[in-house]
Interface confidence: low
């Protein structure tokens, strides 16, 4: 099997012509033993081919997980999920793209693309490495947490005397502690004023303001439509 | 009005392949999100997930029964058909398809089910 | 495989009681699971979705509550069309399975 024709992720099903949003798998990658992976793949959004690693719509699932968790993925992969920072990673090892999809209890959408985007091994702790913001929701709020190390419950590696995955619930590359928070507590309508533990996006709604669904996708920076 | 009809043999013999078609209408398999499963009962039991396939052809299968089981659909005569080979006396049960709509794997919508018989 | 059990298997209770039937996982579910309710010779019903979402058009006597392994179903005041065989669905992941079933017989 020659480079072109594997399969890496969603956008190289998008080459060999699958146009369709949805439920795919992929195949195992014997040079770097990584198993069969099921992903979400969106191929309609901004020229699609986004391989889907973080979706909250539904509050079905806890993202008050442990490193392990937050390692191997967890959650349901037609509703709410962490794809796995083992995977994340992985697939971030071509340079990529990440983009950021937000919307309130509004029924207002916003979004944010980063040039570039990949995460570090488990070794360097899934360090965030991200590039040039754009997009329409105000500030970017992850530039805070560029450069940072991921921390979970039962692994503090933040940059504060607090520790913030306990104090945020959630597993997230804190800093000191957030200026987002896409893996926090899902509120639903009318508790999700009143926390500051929640999904959050500091440039836009504020620190309090529990948002009513996120996705984060990742394609390829080379990728064309 | 959102309906699912099965239909198929209700006799079949033992090592025969069974074919099932799922004849739907009210809904389309070609919108996001819609798949349609089959599900079995045996007479007097619980009832067991076999198969699905959804709007962009995902098919997911039951582990204890894949290698025997194949899912198709026509999206554009809003049909799915399920086979089933080697077929033995175990597999005597009413056999309904479903809709599978939304964001979670549950069957909001049945077929009345079609009773299978396998014997000689 | 995620097993789903089901207690009691067989239960018999008159017109107005209360009744709750409980489901548990093998593994934590969060909140995908399902209930059905199934009448003699008749398809399944959908009952209750996400463990607590009631379906449309389902009687607001059930109920479902429960997250993580332990679900019930409750049916506040038991009317005469209640009595059939009811079935909880893990809707976490695939292979899909069901419960074992709990028949609601009348006393």
């Known amino acids: 099997q020659t480079s072109a024709d594997a399969i890496y992720d969603c956008s190289s099903l998008y080459q060999k012509n699958y146009r369709i949003s949805g439920v795919y798998k992929l195949p195992p990658d014997e040079f770097l033993g990584s198993p069969e992976l099921e992903v979400f793949c969106d191929m309609e959004t901004s020229g699609g081919g986004w391989t889907i690693i973080q979706r909250r719509k539904s509050g079905l699932v806890s993202f008050y997980q442990d490193w392990r968790q937050y390692k191997q993925g967890f959650g349901s992969i037609r509703g709410d999920f962490w794809l796995g920072n083992e995977h994340i990673h992985r697939l971030t090892r071509q340079p990529s793209r990440l983009r950021v999809e937000l919307e309130d209890w509004e029924g207002n959408a916003r979004y944010a693309e980063y040039s570039y985007f990949a995460l570090g091994n488990e070794l360097n702790s899934y360090r965030l490495f991200l590039g040039n913001y754009s997009g329409n929701v105000g500030k970017d709020a992850l530039l805070y947490h560029n450069n940072t190390v991921f921390s979970t419950k039962d692994k503090d590696n933040d940059n504060c005397l607090d520790k913030c995955a306990q104090l945020r619930k959630g597993g997230y590359w804190y800093n000191c502690c957030t200026d987002s928070n896409l893996n926090g507590v899902y509120y639903r309508l009318g508790e999700h004023r009143k926390h500051m533990d929640g999904i959050s996006w500091y440039g836009w709604h504020g620190a309090n303001y529990s948002l009513k669904r996120v996705e984060m996708k990742i394609r390829p920076e080379a990728f064309k439509p | 009005q959102i309906t699912l009809k099965e239909s198929g043999p209700t006799l079949v013999k033992p090592t025969q392949t069974l074919t099932l078609t799922c004849t739907f209408s009210g809904f389309s398999l070609s919108t996001s999100g819609v798949g349609v499963g089959w599900i079995r009962q045996p007479p007097g039991k619980a009832l067991e997930w076999l198969a699905l396939?959804?709007?962009?052809?995902?098919?997911r299968y039951s582990p204890s029964l894949k290698s025997r089981l194949t899912i198709t659909k026509d999206t554009s005569k809003n049909l799915v058909v399920l086979t089933m080979t080697n077929m033995d006396p175990v597999d005597t049960a009413t056999y309904y398809c479903a809709r599978d709509y939304g964001d979670y794997w549950f069957f909001d919508l049945w077929g009345r089910g079609t009773p299978v018989t396998v014997s000689s | 495989d995620i097993q789903m059990t089901q207690s009691p298997s067989s239960l018999s209770a008159s017109v107005g009681d209360r009744v709750t039937i409980t489901c548990r996982a093998s593994q934590g579910i969060s909140s995908y699971l399902a209930w059905y309710q199934q009448k003699p010779g008749k398809a399944p019903k959908l009952l209750i979705y996400a463990a607590s979402s009631l379906q449309s058009g389902v009687p607001s006597r059930f109920s479902g509550s429960g997250s993580g392994t332990d679900f019930t179903l409750t049916i506040s005041s038991l009317q005469p069309e209640d009595f059939a065989t009811y079935y909880c669905q893990q809707s976490f992941s695939t292979p899909l399975t069901f419960g074992g079933g709990t028949k609601l017989e009348i006393k």
């Open positions: 396939i959804y709007w962009n052809d995902d098919k």
